[in-house]
């Protein structure tokens, strides 16, 4: 037969610790029931009576089994630079990640603080290593025999083209120019074209509270803006 | 993202000890309980031990209790797992994961680090 | 300690077929049961909580349903990508345990 169970609340036997989805109140010195995610403790709990729950309001959550007396704040609105990748409710935090074409420049435990946009490679300079979520485009001088002629940050440096009679000779940020005659061959014929990183997150990410709700989350600096590398254009 | 990496293991003999470490990123790491699973070479799971956020509670399968010790640095957002008077039968994949609602629901997982205890 | 008795070991079955497991607790555990899969070689992954709750991302031909001691996890149209182990796990109380998995593959 199984054990008998014990009903919160009740005093733990000497040395053991409350069950799952228990804590221990100092105060009345029991076991008592903690408030399910999207809840959180109205009323503590007593010799005589158990915990009482009530739902998170508008904006708040909890989402762990908690005694907490306050549901904590959903995050801020996302900024126009980013895209909501999960919504505020009773259960989950908002998280904001950054939109296609940005990178996150500052991060936070779940989600990101801080986009940037992905820096463009000018003319004369391709991308050596593309974009991701978390860092930025590198570009890299275009090397003799290729070329980029764009402004991009996902174009990378093609070779010239080879011509039987050269008009004009390629540069880092000009193809070849043929006279009349075409081409012998044509090692590039169009713009080759790096995929853009795409802003998408873990489909079981968990919330967090924001730094200013949860006195335990860890604070990052703010970081000043860096120059852009050699051959990147700012936009 | 949330993403766990555990080390640590390796061969070990017959009552030697090893300590396990797992690194937690993406998450709020000292918001939530963390806990020790392990798979025999060609077996299930096996629940080993828990830990709660802020450490102060600890839970063990017997098997292991006595002999492993659950701990966490939330400085350093890792989980730790003290191996002693190790077993041939301690033979196993170790996972840590983390527990997403402080409900013994294992939410993500690590991929794993092998013990081997053999002389 | 409550024990988790999954079954069948094993089973075999043909791309769309329905695919049922049972998990069963050796006491009343309410709806504190949690699904998971695991193919070779990786780590497991949640699939279902709380008996019958599908977790973020999880395709909607997995499900779960039960309470008390007596559980279900069904596949409604078995594909090739879940040739994998499952396993139960009851939440109800430490120590936390897993039924002995149930290893699905293709006929």
């Known amino acids: 037969l199984p054990a008998q169970v014990a009903f919160t609340p009740y005093a733990p036997e000497p040395g053991s610790t409350c069950r799952l989805r228990e804590y221990y109140d100092q105060t009345a010195q029991m076991c008592c029931s903690k408030c399910s995610p999207g809840q959180h403790a109205k009323v503590f709990c007593t010799k005589t009576s158990d915990t009482v729950c009530d739902s998170c309001e508008d904006s708040t959550y909890t989402q762990l089994w908690n005694w907490v007396p306050e549901c904590l704040s959903c995050g801020s609105r996302c900024s126009s630079d980013q895209v909501e990748t999960q919504a505020c409710t009773r259960e989950q935090n908002r998280i904001c990640t950054c939109r296609p074409g940005w990178y996150c420049a500052l991060s936070k435990q779940e989600g990101c603080r801080l986009c940037a946009p992905l820096r463009k490679c000018r003319p004369g300079f391709g991308v050596a290593r593309p974009g991701t979520e978390t860092s930025d485009v590198v570009c890299k001088p275009c090397a003799p025999g290729t070329f980029s002629n764009t402004t991009s940050s996902t174009d990378i440096c093609r070779p010239h083209q080879i011509c039987n009679v050269v008009a004009i000779p390629g540069n880092a940020s000009m193809d070849a120019v043929c006279t009349s005659t075409s081409p012998t061959r044509s090692m590039a014929p169009g713009a080759v074209h790096l995929p853009q990183p795409v802003s998408t997150r873990s489909q079981h990410t968990q919330p967090t509270p924001e730094p200013s709700t949860a006195p335990s989350t860890s604070f990052l600096l703010p970081m000043g803006p860096s120059p852009p590398a050699e051959g990147s254009t700012g936009d | 993202q949330v993403q766990l990496l555990e080390s640590g293991g390796g061969l070990v003999q017959p009552g030697g000890s090893l300590r396990l470490s797992c690194a937690a990123s993406?998450?709020?790491?000292?918001?939530?309980?963390m806990t020790w699973v392990r798979q025999a070479p060609g077996k299930g799971l096996e629940w080993v031990s828990a830990?709660?956020?802020?450490?102060?509670?600890?839970f063990y399968a017997d098997s292991v209790k006595g002999r492993f010790t659950i701990s966490r640095d939330n400085s350093k957002n890792t989980l730790y797992l003290q191996m002693n008077s190790l077993r041939a039968e301690d033979t196993a994949v170790y996972y840590c994961?983390?527990?997403?609602?402080?409900?013994?629901?294992?939410?993500?997982w690590g991929q794993g680090t092998l013990v081997t205890v053999s002389s | 300690d409550i024990q988790m008795t999954q079954s069948p070991s094993s089973l075999s079955a043909s791309v769309g077929d329905r695919v049922t497991i049972t998990c069963q607790a050796s006491?009343?555990?309410?709806?504190?049961l949690n699904w998971y899969q695991q193919k070779p070689g990786k780590a497991p992954k949640l699939l279902i909580y709380?008996?019958?709750t599908l977790e973020t991302g999880v395709p909607s031909r997995f499900s779960g349903s039960g309470s008390g001691t007596d559980f279900t996890f069904t596949i409604s149209s078995l594909q090739p990508e879940d040739i994998a182990t499952y396993y139960c796990?009851?939440?109800?109380?430490?120590?936390?345990?897993f039924g002995q998995g149930t290893k699905v593959e293709i006929k």
């Open positions: 994961a983390r527990d997403g609602t402080y409900a013994a629901r294992f939410d993500y």
């Open positions: 993406g998450f709020t790491f000292n918001t939530y309980a």
């Open positions: 830990i709660s956020d802020s450490g102060g509670d600890t």
């Open positions: 006491q009343d555990i309410s709806n504190y």
């Open positions: 709380d008996a019958s």
């Open positions: 796990q009851q939440s109800d109380s430490f120590p936390i345990t």
